[in-house]
Interface confidence: low
């Protein structure tokens, strides 16, 4: 009970108490990508590893088709972990040529439905250019914040690129949330 | 309780409720390394002040010997960030020589050791190549998750060269973890 | 209870527990910066958006004039993202022309101010040295951990250079902190 | 290119551990996930387990679980499978599968066969 | 556990027919995945992530359903098609496989 054990003596209104133990909780690990179809101008969603390894959902926590379906209303720390690996970006090259000199980019993005609104809420965005003079390049994007959800949104992280998408290791590539 | 103030009349089993300030939580901020020997392939673990300054160990959560030692199963927020400074990498003149042009790199692994287990397990790994056309360069590397731990596990943060890591204030690199 | 449901017959005493949903927290999300004023050698603090859209503070935790106020003293953990953005650094040039070769770079710092104390805290940082060999750049800095903080703190978040902060959306650039 | 190949006894006593090396090139074996499965005689296939040899981390088919052991050697590019207090029951064709998030690639199988 | 159950057991097609084998799981998986079994051999990937060609798999094979439902089809039988097919869930614990069709030619 707030701030005391037991429930003074004049009548008050407390809100509920739970055991941590059982709040909505999900660490799901990366797994190798599939080309998938997607709309124009619209990232693709990764899909994930739900029990294997490190991975896990409990509490009513679900995972399904790329998403993690909220059970209860409440505020969750949600984040992810993108590690990104591919060739040299030619942006040098573009730059020298002449051509137009928007740098290569690698984005995450975890994204929000709700069935009733028409329209996906982009929680939390970390996006990079990529204009490496090296060979191969390899960076992760890191995201992490506190949001107020509702019972039966869904959660999504999606990718402007799956193909440069690190999927070797469950270390590298995560996504997470739990109710606070 | 779960969901309600008192207990139902009805018999029911909750799980057990607990005080958040009795929760096992540390964080460690980053002391001056001395170098050590590490068996090759391994990366070297960091050591960490956890009692000076913004550091602080509590509630049986206990640092010692470059491990924070975890002293009740649960599921653990676990934390790190390590800001890496260095000179310039040569990875631009190694490419124009025509070596081999694999980047410099730098890494970031939170290990979790489990004297039951022979093999310590990779919870987290933050990776970026370094290929710097400047000449000192600095960055972080963030990483942050929530894992299901047991009573005994030890957690430790490893690098890929313990020489890069800047150690010189400890808002800039640190360690941290706390039961949900 | 810790432990279990009721109390034991035996007196014991027991931090008091507390329903997690009245827990002070806060998301703020960024708004676009007026340039302001500030000391030699000190960042420049962000302001905030606290209500609109992605953002909120509730349970008493307030914001007003850059800073949250720390309702409650206990463990928070707290967080931010700030996305820059920005010309080509011309750290290349400056090298081969043979001026000093330290590099241009970007920070982010997390502070606490506490009345009682004559300086502010800083709790978190996140730097790093800006190098690009294309033109327009672009990248997050996040940062993220836990500390003990007294009621009536007061927490901002500063940045090396105001004018790189990118403001178009409340997912790019956002600060929070929650009680644990 | 990729290869798998599995190698051991082929034949084992009832009650005796079965034990079984899987070797690999062609490949980063840290780069995948290394699964074990088998095939009894004229029967389907049964997935036992697999292992991320980057980590270590393991996940066992319950219904074998209290019985097998999947370990690496990264140094070797190998990975073994125990399986211990064997029966006629166990008696199979053993295949290791290389897969990076789905199976991909397998060895060409090593008879084993459980008899006294 | 997830339960594969694939259907028919057995099926014997004429060389140019369109063959068609489907695997129902016991609870809703994201994607499923085939192989190919020649008599004494390995298994082969055939189809990933429901409707993908593996590598160097001819267009003849494909893959598709959703849910619990998933469908393998052969467009046109030929002789050197004559195998067990078998699909695999991977997302549940254990990876369980479907029993296998055998197909023959008639």
């Known amino acids: 009970l707030k701030g005391q054990e037991f429930a003074p003596s004049h009548q008050q209104v407390y809100a509920p108490l739970r055991a941590d133990g059982d709040k909505p909780r999900a660490h799901l690990t990366v797994v190798r990508q599939t080309p998938t179809q997607h709309f124009k101008n619209q990232f693709p969603a990764l899909h994930w590893e739900h029990e294997l390894g490190l991975a896990f959902t409990k509490n009513r926590m679900n995972y399904t088709n790329k998403f993690l379906l909220i059970p209860e209303s409440g505020d969750y720390f949600i984040y992810s972990q993108v590690t990104f690996r591919g060739m040299t970006s030619e942006c040098s090259e573009i730059r020298q040529a002449g051509r137009p000199n928007k740098p290569d980019s690698i984005t995450v993005v975890i994204t929000k439905v709700t069935d009733s609104y028409p329209e996906p809420t982009q929680l939390l965005m970390g996006t990079k250019s990529v204009c490496e003079v090296g060979s191969n390049w390899f960076q992760p994007i890191y995201l992490g914040a506190m949001f107020s959800l509702q019972e039966g949104d869904k959660l999504m992280v999606n990718v402007s690129d799956i193909s440069l998408v690190d999927y070797t290791k469950e270390d590298k590539t995560f996504f997470g949330a739990f109710l606070l | 309780l779960k969901g309600q103030e008192f207990a139902p009349s009805h018999q029911q089993v909750y799980a057990p409720l607990r005080a958040d300030g009795d929760k096992p939580r540390a964080h460690l901020t980053v002391v001056r390394q001395t170098p050590t020997q590490h068996f090759k392939n391994q990366f070297p673990a960091l050591h960490w002040e956890h009692e000076l300054g913004l550091a602080f160990t509590k509630n049986r959560m206990n640092y010692t010997n470059k491990f924070l030692l975890i002293p009740e199963s649960g599921d653990y927020f676990i934390y790190s960030q390590v800001t890496f400074r260095g000179m310039t990498s040569e990875c631009s003149e190694i490419r124009q020589a025509g070596r081999p042009n694999k980047p410099d790199s730098i890494t970031v692994v939170i290990t979790k050791v489990t004297d039951s287990y022979p093999e310590p397990t990779q919870l987290l790994m933050g990776t970026k190549s370094v290929c710097e056309v400047g000449s000192n360069w600095f960055q972080p590397i963030y990483l942050g998750a929530m894992f299901s731990l047991q009573e005994g596990d030890k957690l430790m943060v490893n690098v890929s060269d313990i020489s890069l890591v800047d150690y010189t204030k400890e808002d800039k690199t640190f360690f941290g973890a706390f039961l949900l | 209870l810790k432990g279990q449901e009721f109390a034991p017959s035996h007196q014991q005493v027991y931090a008091p527990l507390r329903a997690d949903g009245d827990k002070p927290r806060a998301h703020l999300t960024v708004v676009r910066q007026t340039p302001t004023q500030h000391f030699k050698n000190q960042f420049p603090a962000l302001h905030w958006e606290h209500e609109l859209g992605l953002a909120f503070t509730k349970n008493r935790m307030n914001y007003t004039n850059k800073f949250l106020l720390i309702p409650e003293s206990g463990d928070y953990f707290i967080y931010s993202q700030v996305t820059f953005r920005g010309m080509t650094s011309e750290c290349s040039e400056i090298r081969q022309a043979g001026r000093p070769n330290k590099p241009d770079s970007i920070t982010v710092v997390i502070t606490k101010v506490t009345d009682s104390y004559p300086e502010p805290t800083q709790l978190l940082m996140g730097t790093k040295s800006v190098c690009e060999v294309g033109s327009n750049w672009f990248q997050p800095i996040y940062l993220g951990a836990m500390f003990s903080l007294q009621e009536g703190d007061k927490l901002m978040v500063n940045v090396s250079d105001i004018s790189l902060v990118d403001y178009t959306k409340e997912d790019k650039t956002f600060f929070g902190a929650f009680l644990l | 290119q990729v290869q798998l190949q599995e190698s051991g006894p082929g034949l084992v006593r009832p009650s005796q551990t079965l034990s079984l090396t899987c070797t690999v090139s062609g490949f980063d074996l840290q780069d995948t996930y290394i699964h074990w499965v088998r095939q009894r005689p004229g029967r389907g296939l049964e997935w036992m387990g697999r292992?991320?040899?980057?980590?270590?981390?393991?996940k066992y088919n319950p219904s074998l679980k209290s019985r097998v052991t999947i370990t690496r050697d990264t140094s070797k590019n190998q990975v073994s499978l125990r399986l211990s207090s064997v029966t006629a029951a166990d008696t199979a064709v053993y295949y290791c599968?290389?897969?990076?998030?789905?199976?991909?690639?397998w060895g060409q199988g090593s008879l084993v066969t459980v008899s006294s | 556990d997830i339960q594969m159950t694939q259907s028919p057991s057995s099926l014997s097609a004429s060389v140019g027919d369109r063959v068609t084998i489907t695997c129902r799981a016991s609870?809703?998986?994201?994607?499923m995945y085939w192989y190919q079994q020649k008599p004494g051999k390995a298994p082969k990937d055939l189809i990933y992530?429901?409707?993908n060609l593996a590598s160097g798999v001819p267009s003849r094979f494909s893959g598709s359903g959703s849910g619990t439902d998933f469908t393998f089809t052969i467009s046109s039988l030929q002789p050197e098609d004559i195998a067990t097919y078998y699909c695999q869930q991977w997302e549940g614990n254990p990876r369980s496989f479907g029993q296998g069709t055998k197909v023959e030619i008639k």
């Open positions: 992530a429901t409707s």
């Open positions: 292992i991320d040899p980057a980590s270590g981390h393991l």
């Open positions: 599968a290389r897969s990076g998030g789905m199976t991909d690639y």
């Open positions: 609870f809703s998986v994201d994607y």
